[in-house]
């Protein structure tokens, strides 16, 4: 069978905490060089389920700044520009990985943390529960 | 500005690569314990800009499995359940941090990488360019 050759240039892993503790190079490699810089930048205003972006800052976290979406309305904007409460604006959430300084205030020691962020909003048909 | 006191229990940072290379504990701490497990799980079907989720797996990346949203239609679903091409379904994208094995196949050495993922779709009013 295939043997995935372990790279001989790998750092030493004889750490007593291995494999829980790993070395991470914080020099970020950005794979998004060919993406449209506009991206979804104006969708928050043009959407039928518009949202506001709130800045969340935490110096003990990496990245320290995260933007959170909050839907502007309970309903969705209809063709007349009014809020239609027969539809619902809901946040689209995603779990993302961040680095949390651990122990606190340490410049070079982190722990992976999973947090839930709202990225934007979408308009959905509500689930109607009929009472018998 | 604020001066964060350095914790005396911090690991040694006399690494020649410091502060680019840090230690990270991969034991994930999940902050989402009180979140609704349903979350946006069915929004992809109920949205007026529905989407499909595609699996992307990569053992050289952490997390190794990422789900990408692809909008089902160019237009949005109207009240009659038909696609209305006067509106546009667009992906809501977010830059997220992942860990990339570096050098490749190394079990305990990573580099931070920024990738752009589509989390879901929203319905927007199109930008109409009028020709003079």
């Amino acid at each position: 069978g295939i043997t995935i050759p372990r790279n001989p240039g790998c750092p030493n892993s004889e750490d007593k905490n291995f494999p829980r503790t790993v070395m991470v190079n914080l020099n970020i490699h950005n794979r998004n060089t060919n993406t449209n810089p506009k991206r979804s930048s104006d969708y928050y205003n043009r959407s039928t389920s518009p949202w506001n972006l709130h800045r969340n800052e935490d110096p003990e976290r990496y990245p320290s700044v995260i933007w959170e979406a909050k839907c502007r309305h309970l309903g969705c904007i209809n063709a007349d520009g009014n809020v239609d409460y027969h539809m619902n604006s809901v946040p689209i959430q995603q779990e993302i990985l961040v680095l949390r300084r651990e122990p606190p205030h340490c410049p070079n020691s982190f722990r992976l943390e999973k947090i839930l962020v709202s990225v934007g909003c979408t308009c959905v048909t509500p689930i109607v529960h009929h009472v018998a | 500005g604020i001066t964060i006191p350095r914790n005396p229990g911090c690991p040694n940072s006399e690494d020649k690569n410091f502060p680019r290379t840090v230690m990270v504990n991969l034991n994930i701490h999940n902050r989402n314990t009180n979140t609704n497990p349903k979350r946006s799980s069915d929004y992809y079907n109920r949205s007026t800009s529905p989407w499909n989720l595609h699996r992307n797996e990569d053992p050289e990346r952490y997390p190794s499995v990422i789900w990408e949203a692809k909008c089902r239609h160019l237009g949005c679903i109207n009240a009659d359940g038909n696609v209305d091409y006067h509106m546009n379904s667009v992906p809501i994208q977010q830059e997220i941090l992942v860990l990339r094995r570096e050098p490749p196949h190394c079990p305990n050495s990573f580099r931070l990488e920024k990738i752009l993922v589509s989390v879901g779709c929203t319905c927007v009013t199109p930008i109409v360019h009028h020709v003079a």
């Epitope: 069978g1 295939i2 995935i4 | 595609h54 699996r55 992307n56 797996e57 990569d58 053992p59 050289e60 190794s64 499995v65 990408e68 692809k70």
Partner: antibody, heavy 124, light 110 residues
Amino acid sequence: EVQLLESGGGVVQPGRSLRLSCAASGFIFSNYGMHWVRQAPGKGLEWVAVISYDGSNKYYADSVKGRFTISRDNSKNTLYLEMNSLRPEDTAVYYCAKVGASGDYYYSYGLDVWGQGTTVTVSS
Amino acid sequence: QSVLTQPPSASGTPGQTVSISCSGSHSNIGRHPVDWYQQVPGAAPKLLMYYGGYRPSGVPDRFSGSQSGTSASLAISGLQSEDEADYYCATWDDRLVGYVFGSGTKVTVL
């Protein structure tokens, strides 16, 4: 030695059923996703189905969807392919193959171990 | 018809370099790493290259792979008689939700 051994092939009439087995040895079977791939006489390789390491997820080629079922018994280190409503175009050598990366992967690092194949002939 | 397109045949004399292309789309090669398989007549396929350009142990370094955009290629340098075989590219396809193989290329050593 890592090995996959298919069995259960044979000659069958159109519309009938057949069950293929693939016995695995030499690796921790329950850690790997598994595939079935077929090759019609004189033709190229055609992917049939994949099953996740724990059997919770399965995907099929459109040509076999609704007729074939992939399954596994990790306690017996065995992969199965249940083939119903067989057609002449299902005639092929059927190979089972193992995913290269261990864990929740369907295709990562390729299909690194293949069986020798078992022949299925659908003919009246 | 395969969603991954390969030339039906390629040939070269011993010692030469032969290249095989594999063309796909954004739903397959555009998003997933490509694998290459070698199949000699009468035998089961063998993994030759994985993750776009990595060789499993035991595969000679005469074989190299690359991937860019929606296409991939396999190069065989210093062609030898034992390289005479069928070669298939393969990857995952998001639209079909499955693993897909290329149409195959028969390499002949003249």
